[in-house]
């Protein structure tokens, strides 16, 4: 499994995982104790024809062609979670691991 | 862990699964010797904010907006394998477990 | 023949509103990202705004960002620029142009159309 | 941003002469780099991209050398058509940045 990793300034244009800081704070999620901060990345780019596609299921659709079906879109092919603590609904305070909170490489699906 | 299921005649705009018979023999992949047609699923749609959206990441990049970056998209949330015989590059016939061939469910990523 | 014909330049007050077009034609259009830009009265060329072929992904100069707005209409073979709170600054002529897809990078552009001008004064 | 620097701002050549010109950048672009040509009153017409690679229809008399942050844009025998404005500009990195221009005037 391969994927592109860009940085901030690139003018790549293919489907690329890119870095994102996320901030709690600035977006007024206060219900999260910590991290305050963590690294998200995202995926961005076009997904021509063949290139980055995760599963074979995608090559398939696209010859198939039916209607209404879309190209395939760069996103997340492998995500990995972050430890957390928050406050639940009921103001309880709970420590726990949010899965897919990372992405780790992006493709073509 | 939830995703539309609509027929091919639905005017559904939102994220959705489709069902597609995928057919070897019409595409000419003729090292497949079984199953020579397959139900393979595939996604269509429309992503508009917050709907059927997999991760809280999809959320997050959202609201951080980076440079570049698309909304999510109508992609597989769940896929299963099929067991298929085939021959391979070297002519010898395999039977195995082939991942990822079968769209289960959609949502927006 | 690879053409791209801009239109929708014009007078306008200062704070006001805009919309330029670019008809494109002799190529797939979808295929190819597409950019903006400017050339202010007897200056150097300004990028302004590139959209990715299938309009997913979008990249603004920081001096446009949040009053400019790119977007393209495959179905149309057109490109778009909504240019909101114009400020004198603006003042320019707009092509746009063609991404030449020489690498996997954005920005090389091969085709460029005649420009339409924009002046914003009151 | 990077920061594209084209020197000399104005070159003074006989026609049948050589010219030189010359592009540098703040940093390292690769060979992410296009020369473009401009005369009064029309639209930029990319010449080289790829920093060594003519387009489609120019003339072997352009080329273009370099890589990373120095480049060179050489007209080997000026013609009458080639007097004008030169651009180089990079794509290597948001936001796409241009020189300021070099004039090309006969002397």
């Known amino acids: 499994d391969f994927g592109l990793d860009c940085d901030e300034h690139s003018t790549e244009s293919r489907c690329c995982r890119y870095p994102l800081t996320v901030d709690f704070e600035a977006f007024g999620w206060d219900w999260i104790i910590a991290p305050k901060r963590y690294k998200a990345n995202y995926c961005s780019g076009e997904c021509e024809f063949v290139f980055l596609q995760k599963y074979p299921h995608t090559h398939l659709v696209h010859q198939a062609n039916p209607r209404g079906s879309a190209g395939p879109c760069c996103t997340p092919t492998k995500m990995s979670p972050i430890n957390m603590l928050y406050f639940n609904g009921k103001e309880q305070i709970i420590y726990g691991k949010i899965p897919a909170m990372v992405v780790d490489r992006c493709g073509c699906s | 862990d939830f995703g539309l299921d609509c027929d091919e005649h639905s005017t559904e705009s939102r994220c959705c699964r489709y069902p597609l018979t995928v057919d070897f023999e019409a595409f000419g992949w003729d090292w497949i010797i079984a199953p020579k047609r397959y139900k393979a699923n595939y996604c269509s749609g429309e992503c508009e904010f917050v709907f059927l959206q997999k991760y809280p990441h999809t959320h997050l990049v959202h609201q951080a907006n980076p440079r570049g970056s698309a909304g999510p998209c109508c992609t597989p949330t769940k896929m299963s394998p099929i067991n298929m015989l085939y021959f391979n590059g070297k002519e010898q016939i395999i039977y195995g477990k082939i991942p990822a061939m079968v769209v289960d469910r959609c949502g927006c990523s | 023949e690879v053409q791209l014909l801009e239109s929708g330049g014009g007078l306008i007050q200062p704070g006001g509103s805009l919309r330029l077009s670019c008809a494109a034609s002799g190529f797939t259009f979808s295929s190819f990202a597409m950019s903006w830009v400017r050339q202010a009265p007897g200056k150097g060329l300004e990028w302004v705004s590139t959209i990715s072929g299938s309009g997913g992904s979008t990249y603004y100069a920081d001096f446009v960002k949040g009053r400019f707005t790119i977007s393209r209409d495959n179905s149309k073979n057109t490109l778009y620029l909504q240019m909101n709170s114009l400020r004198a600054e603006d003042t320019a002529v707009y092509y746009c142009?063609?991404?030449?897809?020489?690498?996997?990078?954005?920005?090389?552009?091969?085709?460029w159309g005649q420009g339409t001008m924009v002046t914003v004064s009151s | 941003e990077i920061v594209m620097t084209q020197s000399p701002a104005t070159l003074s050549v006989s026609p049948g002469e050589r010219a030189t010109l010359s592009c540098r950048a703040s940093?390292?672009?690769?060979?992410?780099l296009a020369w473009f040509q401009q005369k009064p009153g029309q639209a930029p017409r990319l010449l080289i991209y790829?920093?060594?690679t003519r387009a489609t229809g120019i003339p072997a008399r352009f080329s273009g050398s370099g890589s990373g942050t120095e480049f060179t844009l050489t007209i080997s025998s000026l013609q009458s058509e080639d007097f004008a404005v030169y651009y180089c500009?990079?794509?290597?990195?948001?936001?796409?940045?241009f020189g300021g221009g070099t004039k090309v005037e006969i002397k």
């Open positions: 790829g920093a060594s």
């Open positions: 142009a063609k991404d030449g897809r020489y690498n996997w990078n954005y920005g090389a552009f091969d085709i």
């Open positions: 940093q390292s672009v690769r060979s992410n």
């Open positions: 500009q990079q794509y290597n990195n948001w936001p796409l940045t």
